[in-house]
Interface confidence: low
Amino acid sequence: MLRRRGSPGMGVHVGAALGALWFCLTGALEVQVPEDPVVALVGTDATLCCSFSPEPGFSLAQLNLIWQLTDTKQLVHSFAEGQDQGSAYANRTALFPDLLAQGNASLRLQRVRVADEGSFTCFVSIRDFGSAAVSLQVAAPYSKPSMTLEPNKDLRPGDTVTITCSSYQGYPEAEVFWQDGQGVPLTGNVTTSQMANEQGLFDVHSILRVVLGANGTYSCLVRNPVLQQDAHSSVTITPQRSPTGAVEVQVPEDPVVALVGTDATLRCSFSPEPGFSLAQLNLIWQLTDTKQLVHSFTEGRDQGSAYANRTALFPDLLAQGNASLRLQRVRVADEGSFTCFVSIRDFGSAAVSLQVAAPYSKPSMTLEPNKDLRPGDTVTITCSSYRGYPEAEVFWQDGQGVPLTGNVTTSQMANEQGLFDVHSVLRVVLGANGTYSCLVRNPVLQQDAHGSVTITGQPMTFPPEALWVTVGLSVCLIALLVALAFVCWRKIKQSCEEENAGAEDQDGEGEGSKTALQPLKHSDSKEDDGQEIA
């Protein structure tokens, strides 16, 4: 789950084992970043996680920290001389000063842009130093596609129509699929173009040309490959003429799905009578349930928004019968039904539903306990995904894709904006090893966000520090035993030679000097020489 990088120059030869033992005990610097790319939505804030293992007695005055772009080495943010040196990256970065002393060198990148995508290196230097690179993958959800028909009236079976599916402000480039009412893919006569705007976000336009039958439904699906978010719309064409005279107010049958913070268009159209002028038009948008006024047009003039100043009509299109309402910076509280009421001579109304949605973040996975795990241990795996709407569906499965339903507790809490943070806890007994996946599904966006963790139980392994201590103590013990054996051997040898010397003294005087000198010839130390002479 974590990519670990030690400091450069950590290779140690066997001959320097004791030096390495000291090095490990004093604490090699380990810099850790997530292995998976950090996925961040355009306009939101992203945290590039980076942690290091502070030595005992570590103080911030010793810390040198640099965040830089991996490819260009451009400085992003730094901490030196006990002080945050600030952002060198458009004033959009910040560290977590209260957490630095605990080894948290993470970087907060604010108001993420497409141009931020790429690799960021976290470089930490205390006595030792190390670095690791984390990837930032930028994404932006595509808007619910809008569908247009050309021609859009007086249609008869056999006519050729061009259906355009447009989805806006997404990233990265989308995949577009067309299908008919039976779900059969339509691949012929499709032209798709994608254009990036100055922020790097893509607008996708896909055009399908079809020959009309008696009636037909055509669906367009725009997929964001990073968010695994599918945005779809469909249009049903019934070739027939609508009767003249009456005001026919038309709204989409399906709810309009709008992402929190984006703008939504509540479509409403009416059929203007011949000779119609805007001076005759009376248009009211109101909340269906409470009848609260949202926006109005009367006496030939737009009377403006009565709804937190976040609504607008399309004044240039009103004369053609387009009474659609633009709702800006959608909030969760906007969800519900809006009524479009049109009166000329005749009158009519229709209600359109607004379904608010927000994609869930990629889940973060945590383990408790998270070290010294062995088969048979019970672990708690927490899967957390943030700031989504509406409430999520959470699914757990093992590495073989088998659903895990027992011992799962899921809680969802709404914040003050009405967005949900979901926390799902799975309790499992570890096998030899296992992968556990958590899938957080947004039921409206049909967006699946998943995270997984692979746990390898290691019954006979030690943490590196314990291993080095064990090796060091073993070396010391062996050295002690060898020294002891050597001393014992010398003592035995000495006593044997003393006995031999005594026997030779009795045999003859002339041999004495030769025997006294002989141990000196083979001696290994002055101490031994002294003992031998004595």
Partner: nanobody, 123 residues
Framework: QVQLQQSGGGLVQAGDSLRLSCEAS????????MGWFRQAPRQEREFVAA????????YYADNLEGRFTTSRDNAKNTVYLQMNSLKPEDTAVYYC????????????????WGQGTQVTVKP
């Protein structure tokens, strides 16, 4: 171009309260975060408080939190600064401003400024 019109300043006794108003025109007020700063005689302009576009988040200078409160009414395009338990050292010209990119407490983060309103607190 956003214009800011301030009102509500004046001369008060120590311990009194005062409410400053700042009305915005020429933009979508509900999409702006707003801030308050003050400048006492012969001193630097200093940060007082800031409020997010929807009013959900507020941010205060450490020494003022508890006595000063900022709020907004997006329907009236107006932001307010309620000042309680005023002290002589609160005497200053108070400015409201429209926040751009950056930290709330930094002057450089603000794009548009009001004309300022004088607040004088007598001991």
């Amino acid at each position: 171009q956003v214009q800011l019109q301030q009102s509500g300043g004046g001369l008060v006794q120590a311990g009194d309260s005062l409410r400053l108003s700042c009305e915005a025109s020429g933009g979508t007020f509900s999409s702006y975060a707003m801030g308050w700063f003050r400048q006492a005689p012969r001193q630097e302009r200093e940060f007082v408080a800031a409020i997010s576009s929807e009013g959900g988040s507020t941010y205060y200078a450490d020494n003022l939190e508890g006595r000063f409160t900022t709020s907004r009414d997006n329907a009236k395009n107006t932001v307010y600064l309620q000042m309680n338990s005023l002290k002589p050292e609160d005497t200053a010209v108070y400015y409201c401003a429209v926040k751009g990119v950056g930290w709330p407490q930094e002057q450089a983060s603000y794009d548009y400024w009001g004309q300022g309103t004088q607040v004088t607190v007598k001991p």
